[in-house]
């Protein structure tokens, strides 16, 4: 899987679009994990509605909100009041029995609040090649590694 | 019990080189990034570089770029690196160290270390 | 490369004092700084990932902040075995860069 980049700004809330084939998923719910690690496993933050039909409804688990599109086949993620620690290397999944497929490999970049002048010295605007060599940019403040790509550096 | 063995002591001359191996056990070492970080006496720790031993993809810090070539054998589990052109500065603890990765890898762990002396 | 500066390089404190040691970074890495003790002639021992979470196993006592490029370990109340080196290593970029290292000495 490739992994896209979305960037935030620190306070504010952070959408992220998954999209997938509604068909080859039709009737199976939705989560979205965070990953320890580029190979350690994904813990599940927040999943969709216990009954597919109502996976429009949306769910929070915190500042963190899911919300399916199953017709359209779009999964969103709202990340609200984004903090420094929210940054990482995240999941959208698509639940079948105890097995998850992975529908998008997302990471989560946090810059800082352009506004917020305690930080004024310390203000990020990273490059294209800031987290991932090469990485194509999207113009949805989100970008994708290509293929072959690994995400960068493999911390702890 | 998981862990990180690496082999014993080594006393090599300048301009040799030198394979020094990294045997894992309890975990299999393609679920994880394999390091390598050296420290000579008394000076700090140095970063040489990273192997994925799931593809064999490997990267080195541009100090070791040509020098150092770290590889792994997934059949027994096992992670090498080799420095070759043996300098004196080259004498260290030589530690193998295994991550998941970047972003927040809860996985943590570390050989015993392994002196390498150059002296001629 | 990105410059990992530590300080103080050294410090002397008595058992029971709250300790507190800065890192700061050339260029902004997020959070993706780790903390290391080291002991003589022991290997590294990783304390905090990603600026502020404790890993498994390392006591309540230690405690990391920061993001960006400023970023601090403290000990809340120095218990005897603290006594070693401490490295702070960052994890935006490679070649991953390591902190000069700590030492804290027994006053």
């Known amino acids: 899987h490739n992994t896209t980049v979305f960037q935030g700004v620190a306070g504010q809330s952070l959408q992220v679009s998954c999209p997938y084939d509604s068909m080859k998923h039709w009737g199976r719910r939705k989560a979205w994990c965070r990953q320890l690690g580029e190979k350690g496993p994904c813990q599940r933050v927040v999943s969709t509605h216990n009954l597919w039909l109502l996976s429009f409804l949306r769910r929070w688990n915190g500042s963190t909100a899911i919300t399916d599109d199953t017709l359209g086949g779009t999964l969103t993620i709202t990340l609200r009041n984004l903090q420094p620690h929210d940054a990482g290397l995240y999941q959208c999944q698509s639940l079948h029995g105890s097995e998850a497929d992975t529908l998008r490999k997302v990471l989560v970049e946090v810059l800082a609040d352009p506004l917020d002048h305690r930080d004024a010295g310390d203000l990020w605007f990273p490059g294209e090649s800031e987290s991932f060599e090469d990485a194509h940019v999207e113009h949805s403040i989100s970008r994708s590694l290509l293929e072959g790509e690994i995400p960068f550096p493999p911390t702890s | 019990q998981v862990q990180l063995v690496q082999s014993g002591a080594e006393v090599k001359k300048p301009g040799a080189s030198v394979k020094v191996s990294c045997k894992a056990s309890?975990?299999?070492?393609?679920?994880?990034?394999i390091h390598w970080v050296r420290q000579a006496p008394g000076q700090g720790l140095e970063w040489m570089g990273w192997?994925?031993?799931?593809?064999?993809?490997?990267k080195y810090a541009p100090k070791f770029q040509g020098r150092a070539t770290i590889t792994a054998d997934t059949s027994t589990s096992t992670a090498y690196m080799e420095l070759s052109s043996l300098r004196s500065e080259d004498t260290a603890v030589y530690y193998c160290h295994a991550d998941h990765g970047n972003y927040g890898s809860t996985m943590d762990y570390w050989g015993q270390g392994t002196l390498v002396t150059v002296s001629s | 490369d990105i410059q990992m500066t530590q300080s103080p390089s050294s410090l002397s404190a008595s058992v029971g004092d709250r300790v507190t040691i800065t890192c700061h970074a050339s260029q902004h890495i997020n959070v993706w700084l780790s903390w290391y003790q080291q002991k003589p002639g022991k290997a590294p021992k990783l304390l905090i990932y990603k600026a502020s979470n404790l890993h498994t196993g390392v006591p309540s006592r230690f405690s990391g902040s920061g993001s960006g490029t400023d970023f601090t370990l403290t000990i809340s109340s120095l218990q005897p075995e603290d006594f070693a080196t401490y490295y702070c290593?960052?994890?935006?970029?490679?070649?991953?860069?390591f902190g000069q290292g700590t030492k804290v000495e027994i006053k």
């Open positions: 192997i994925d031993p799931e593809n064999g993809e490997s």
């Open positions: 309890g975990f299999s070492i393609e679920d994880f990034y």
């Open positions: 290593q960052q994890g935006q970029t490679y070649p991953r860069t």
